[in-house]
C-alpha cells in the first residue's frame, strides 16, 4: 500500500511540477521592470522567453514577439532549450509513469516491468526538474549581471544636460514559478524512484533448510542474501505474488509451499 501511495503521490507531484514548468515557459513575466528607486513611469516593461510586453497606465498592453532566432542572446536560447527539454522529458515521463502506476492494470504486465517503467519515469522527472531549475537559474543569473551593469550606468546623458532613464529588470513571477515547478518535478521523480524499490520483486529469501547427507549433517542456505540493487534487474527464480500491493517485508514474511524442500 505504501508503494502505491508513494508512486501515486510522485506522479501527482510530478504532474503539478510539469504543468508549472509549461506555465513558466509560456509566461511573459520572466523579467519585470525594476520600479525601486526609479522615476515613476507610466509604462511597465516585462519580458518572457518568447516576447516582450509593455503595459501602459492607460490599461493598454502591447506585446511583441522575438521574430528572430539568430539575433537573440545565446543565454536566452540556452534557457529556451533547457525549458523545452524539461517539458519534453517531463511529458514522456508522465506518459511512461501512467502505465507504470500500480493501480492501473495493463494486460499481464509484470511488477518487474512496472518497476523498470517507474524508475525510467522517475529519472526523467529528475532530469526534467533539473533542466527547469537550471534554465531558470541561468536566466536569473543573466538578470543579476545585467541589473548591476545598468545600475552602474543608471543615467546616461549628453554632458549631464539631458537624462535618459535606463530600464532595469528584476526577477519576474515566471522565475519563481519555474523554481517551484522544477523542485516539485524533482521531488516527484525521487518519489517515483523510491516507489520503484518497493515495486521490484526481490530474490525469495528462503528459510534455512537441512539436507541429510549420508555421513554427517550440513546446513545449506540457498538465496540467503537480498538483491543489493533493489531495481529488479535479475528476475530469475523470483516468485510473482498476486495478492495486491505489499511491502518488501510483507512479501518475504509470508511462507508458501516453496519455502521448504
Amino acid at each position: 500500500m505504501a508503494v502505491t501511495a508513494c508512486q501515486g503521490l510522485g506522479f501527482v507531484v510530478s504532474l503539478i511540477g510539469i504543468a508549472g514548468i509549461i506555465a513558466a515557459t509560456c509566461m511573459d513575466q520572466w523579467s519585470t521592470q525594476d520600479l525601486y528607486n526609479n522615476p515613476v513611469t507610466a509604462v511597465f516593461n516585462y519580458q518572457g522567453l518568447w516576447r516582450s510586453c509593455v503595459r501602459e497606465s492607460s490599461g493598454f498592453t502591447e506585446c511583441r514577439g522575438y521574430f528572430t532566432l539568430l539575433g537573440l542572446p545565446a543565454m536566452l536560447q540556452a534557457v529556451r532549450a533547457l525549458m523545452i527539454v524539461g517539458i519534453v522529458l517531463g511529458a514522456i515521463g508522465l506518459l511512461v509513469s501512467i502505465f507504470a502506476l500500480k493501480c492501473i492494470r495493463i494486460g499481464s504486465m509484470e511488477d518487474s516491468a512496472k518497476a523498470n517503467m517507474t524508475l525510467t519515469s522517475g529519472i526523467m522527472f529528475i532530469v526534467s526538474g533539473l533542466c527547469a531549475i537550471a534554465g531558470v537559474s541561468v536566466f536569473a543569473n543573466m538578470l543579476v549581471t545585467n541589473f548591476w551593469m545598468s545600475t552602474a550606468n543608471m543615467y546616461t546623458g549628453m554632458g549631464g544636460m539631458v537624462q535618459t532613464v535606463q530600464t532595469r529588470y528584476t526577477f519576474g513571477a515566471a522565475l519563481f514559478v519555474g523554481w517551484v515547478a522544477g523542485g516539485l518535478t524533482l521531488i516527484g521523480g525521487v518519489m517515483m524512484c523510491i516507489a520503484c524499490r518497493g515495486l521490484a520483486p526481490e530474490e525469495t529469501n528462503y528459510k534455512a533448510v537441512s539436507y541429510h547427507a549420508s555421513g554427517h549433517s550440513v546446513a545449506y542456505k540457498p538465496g540467503g542474501f537480498k538483491a543489493s540493487t533493489g531495481f529488479g534487474s535479475n528476475t530469475k527464480n523470483k516468485k510473482i505474488y498476486d495478492g495486491g500491493a505489499r511491502t518488501e517485508d510483507e512479501v518475504q514474511s509470508y511462507p508458501s509451499k516453496h519455502d521448504y524442500v
Epitope: Q33, P39, V40, T41, A42, V43, N45, Q47, S52, C53, V54, E56, S57, S58, G59, F60, E62, R64, V162, Q163, T164, V165, Q166, T167
Partner: antibody, heavy 118, light 113 residues
Framework: EVKLVESGGGLVKPGGSLKLSCAAS????????MSWVRQTPEKRLECVAT????????YYPDSVRGRFTISRDIAKNNLYLQMSSLRSEDTALYYC???????????WGQGTLVTVSS | DIVMTQYPSFLTVTTGEKVTMSCKSS????????????LTWYQQKPGQPPKLLIY???TRESGVPDRFAGSGSGTDFTLTISSVQAEDLAIYYC?????????FGSGTKLEVK
Amino acid sequence: EVKLVESGGGLVKPGGSLKLSCAASGFTFSSYGMSWVRQTPEKRLECVATISGGDSYTYYPDSVRGRFTISRDIAKNNLYLQMSSLRSEDTALYYCARSYNGNSLPYWGQGTLVTVSS
Amino acid sequence: DIVMTQYPSFLTVTTGEKVTMSCKSSQSLLNSGNQRNYLTWYQQKPGQPPKLLIYWASTRESGVPDRFAGSGSGTDFTLTISSVQAEDLAIYYCQNNYFYPFTFGSGTKLEVK
C-alpha cells in the same frame, strides 16, 4: 460611443472644498486610465490627477498633492475629484479624460468650471 | 516634474503653407521596452476640449488628416502640417505621457492669414 460628462463645478471660497464628478459610458470603465486635466484662464493645460487602468494607482503633480484626491466608483461608472484647501490658482476649467494608446487622451468631456474667489 | 518646452509660442501662416512646431522635454520620453516615444500632440480649437492628433510621437489618431505628421525621438519632437488649411486655426499642445505627472507644453498658437 464613449461619453464623458463632468459636473460639480462652481464658485468656492479659498480654503473651501468641492467634489467634481464625471459620468462615463460606452466603455469598460475599470479597464482604462482616467485623468482630470484643468485649463487655466491663460490657456495652460495641467494634468492634476491620474488613475491607472486595472490596478487603479493614483498620481498627482506637486501643485495639488495632498489637496486633491481622484477616485472611481466602478458600480456607478463615475470618476471623482475631491478638492480641498482650494486656492485662487485652482481656478480653471476641469476636464475629465480617458486614456488609451501611448497613455494619450483621445476622449474628453466638455469640462466644468471651478472658480476660487473670495 | 518633466518640463515640456514648446516653441514658437505663436505662428502666423497663409493657407497652403507648410508649418513646423517644436517640443522639447527635459528627459527622454523613449521607452526602451518597445522603442516608442511617449509624446502626444493635441489640437484645441476655441471653445472646444483638446483633440488628440498624434500619439507615440508619430502615430496619427484615426480620423486625423494626413497633412499632420509627428516626428522626433528622445527629447526633441516636431509636429508638421504639410499644407495648412483655414480650419487648422488652433492651439497645439505637446504632452509627456511617460513620466508621472503627465505634463503639457505651454502651446503653440497657430493663426491663419
